[in-house]
Interface confidence: low
């Protein structure tokens, strides 16, 4: 399906609004430090050029690839060298190396100020004054902070953002209407970004075979009535979509995602009975709905897996003929029967099955050798089951904040070399698994918990890759995607770690503590907790609890004082001294 002009093809397929939005996202994800106005200018120039190509596909430069056109445009930015340093060297390369170079310079933790939310009236005025600029600014600010955000999904978020303002800026109580909607979009957006980051890591670090295996397992759970051939087709198409988005090919990605949604809706009968309500929605909402659709009911009459995968004498013959297809079918059959398992567990089982066949099909009596293969799955299944049970019990006993603190201590002891902000961010998010998953029925707990933990631990891996400090983290992150979580779970106290010297400045607090939100106060306390563990990795739970209780009392006392700053100045050194004594 070749076109004389790729840019004209995509402009016509996507329409001007989506085309401009996606180009803005692409540019913002590549040049994360550039001012908004600069990106808008570049996008307008690209759009005007695309229109000339739509009018005449033979016009000059219209036959160039999108990477060439976009890369040339990015390389016109005057301040590239001073703003981005060595990223400017990308511009000396030819395609496709230039795009690869830009991709390698995407920064998962850009040095950008946290987004502050202005007063509701200020936001509503800005929305009414220039709706288009207001929405572009949203795309820009999210994309530059989340350089792997799934671009077509970001357009869906922007549509919801627009709808929230359109509705709430007319409301009697604007704030009561708008703020919960913005909170929900923020939280969903962060989750969506993290989930997509894992997909991109899977593709980029472990290859499309790893991503396809993940997709086979997940889609087989969602669509247990679909035939293997149907699931395989969806997996192939989905892999193409995510490969494109993760590779910065956002126009192709959005176009192919729309085609996939169209295909799924035209073939509902052979996929799932749950797609109907999604398929009545407009494009962005439809694609989102299809991605989030609940699992269909399992067919009632599924036979035992043992017949084809253990008892059959043809197992090795079938495996040898087409290894990946046979393993894919095994994964499909296992996953459609087990919506109660995490995708990562299903992939571990498939890996274990593959290892057994590799060993046994070379043995004197293959059948005898692999006859007990399903028994070997038992410990693999029990490990995450027990982990979820224990952690949910702990969560129910402690509540979210203290559960997070328990994880902070646990992970700081495992990998104390990791930076404190990263440990705080990751442990806080690990701790959110409790509220997210522990309230669910037993059959949904493991898939919720373990697959969520995989997303959070990927964030640790991504941040650690940027600034590697721990061999243990590198090992867990790079050896096996499916075993990352068990690898981290198995880490013990790092005996080789040399405790951090005590720095009183780290435990010096001021009156600004008192005006912080509850969340910000928690982060401050949790930061102090990590620093305490880094200083005294062998401190007991009781010792740490004593210091944290003391800290809470000290902050509460000073925040009630008339002269807060004086109180912090006077009580702070006492708190530090008491803490050192308690940990000695």
């Amino acid at each position: 399906d070749t076109h004389k002009s790729e840019v004209a093809h995509r402009f016509k397929d996507l329409g001007e609004e989506h085309f401009k939005g996606l180009v803005l996202v692409a540019f913002s994800q590549y040049l994360q430090q550039c001012p908004f106005e600069e990106h808008v200018k570049l996008v307008n120039e690209v759009t005007e050029f695309a229109k000339t190509c739509v009018a005449d596909e033979s016009a000059e430069n219209c036959d160039k690839s999108l990477h060439t056109l976009f890369g040339d445009k990015l390389c016109t930015v005057a301040t590239l060298r001073e703003t981005y340093g060595e990223m400017a060297d990308c511009c000396a390369k030819q395609e496709p190396e230039r795009n690869e170079c830009f991709l390698q310079h995407k920064d998962d933790n850009p040095n950008l100020p946290p987004l502050v939310r202005p007063e509701v009236d200020v936001m509503c005025t800005a929305f009414h004054d220039n709706e288009a600029t207001f929405l572009k600014k949203y795309l820009y600010e999210v994309a530059r902070r989340h350089p792997y955000f799934y671009a077509p999904e970001l357009l869906f978020f922007a549509a919801r953002y627009k709808a929230a303002f359109a509705e709430c800026c007319q409301a009697a109580d604007k704030a009561a209407c708008l703020l919960p909607k913005l909170d929900e979009l923020r939280d969903e957006g962060k989750a969506s970004s993290a989930k997509q980051r894992l997909k991109c890591a899977s593709l980029q670090k472990f290859g499309d075979r790893a991503f396809k295996a993940w997709a086979v397992a997940r889609l087989s759970q969602k669509f247990p009535k679909a035939e293997f051939a149907e699931v395989s087709k969806l997996v192939t198409d989905l892999t193409k979509v995510h490969t494109e988005c993760c590779h910065g090919d956002l126009l192709e990605c959005a176009d192919d995602r729309a085609d996939l949604a169209k295909y799924m809706c035209e073939n509902q009968d052979s996929i799932s009975s749950k797609l109907k309500e999604c398929c009545d929605k407009p494009l962005l909402e439809k694609s989102h709905c299809l991605a989030e659709v609940e699992n269909d009911e399992m067919p009632a009459d599924l036979p035992s897996l043992a017949a084809d995968y253990v008892e059959s004498k043809d197992v090795c013959k079938n495996y040898a003929e087409a290894k990946d297809v046979f393993l894919g079918m095994f994964l499909y059959e296992y996953a459609r029967r087990h919506p109660d398992y995490s995708v990562m567990l299903l992939l571990r089982l498939a890996k274990a099955y593959e290892a057994t066949l590799e060993k046994c099909c070379a043995a004197a009596d293959p059948h005898e050798c692999y006859a007990k293969v399903f028994d070997e799955f038992q410990p693999l299944v029990e490990e995450p089951q027990n982990l979820v049970k224990q952690n949910c019990e702990l969560f129910e006993q402690l509540g979210e904040y203290k559960f997070q603190n328990a994880l902070l201590v646990r992970y700081t002891k495992k990998v104390p070399q990791v930076s404190t902000p990263t440990l705080v961010e990751v442990s806080r998010n690990l701790g959110k698994v409790g509220a997210k998953c522990c309230k669910l029925p037993e059959a949904k707990r493991m898939p919720c918990a373990e697959d969520y933990l995989s997303v959070v631990l990927n964030r640790l891996c991504v941040l650690h890759e940027k600034t590697p400090v721990s061999e243990k983290v590198t090992k867990c992150c790079t050896e096996s995607l499916v075993n990352r979580r068990p690898c981290f779970s198995a880490l013990e106290l790092d005996e080789a770690y040399v405790p951090k010297a005590f720095n009183a400045e780290t435990f010096t607090f001021h009156a600004d503590m008192c005006t912080l939100s509850e969340k910000e106060k928690q982060v401050k306390k949790q930061t102090a907790l990590v620093e305490l563990v880094k200083h005294k990795p062998k401190a007991t739970k009781e010792q740490l609890k004593g210091v944290m209780d003391n800290f809470a009392a000290f902050v509460e006392k000073c925040c009630k004082a008339d002269d807060k700053e004086a109180c912090f100045a006077e009580e702070g050194p006492k708190f530090v001294a008491a803490s050192q004594a308690a940990l000695a």
Epitope: V116, H510, L516, E520, E565
Partner: nanobody, 115 residues
């Protein structure tokens, strides 16, 4: 509500110095953070420096070592001492303040660095 008024801008030669002031009035007891931002012609807003009520400061690399932020709580005034000025420091400088983030802004004072 907090009102902020900047002063001290003007024309200065490259390598020269300038001291900006920002006088705060109104509900200043709620102010915990004060900061300077700047906007060069045709560019976006850029963070220059911040100081908390406790006195801790931070600066981006572009001004670190050349600019110093300070505040006199008794006079409710924020200062920015700018040394070794460069042509690229030309901008409108804004004072900003707030309890948790900088929600109150001044009107700005123009600094031009040119020979």
């Amino acid at each position: 509500e907090v009102q902020l008024v900047e002063s001290g801008g003007g024309l200065v030669q490259p390598g020269g110095s300038l001291r900006l002031s920002c006088a705060a009035s109104g509900s200043i007891e709620s102010i915990n953070r004060m900061a300077w931002y700047r906007q060069a012609p045709g560019k976006g807003l850029e963070f220059v420096s911040r100081i908390s009520k406790g006195g801790s400061t931070n600066y981006p690399d572009s001004v670190k070592g050349r600019f110093t932020i300070s505040r006199d709580n008794s006079k409710n005034t924020l200062y920015l001492q700018m040394n070794s000025l460069r042509a690229e420091d030309t901008a409108v400088y804004y004072c900003a303040a707030g309890p948790v983030w900088e929600q109150f802004w001044g009107q700005g004072t123009l600094v031009t660095v040119s020979s």
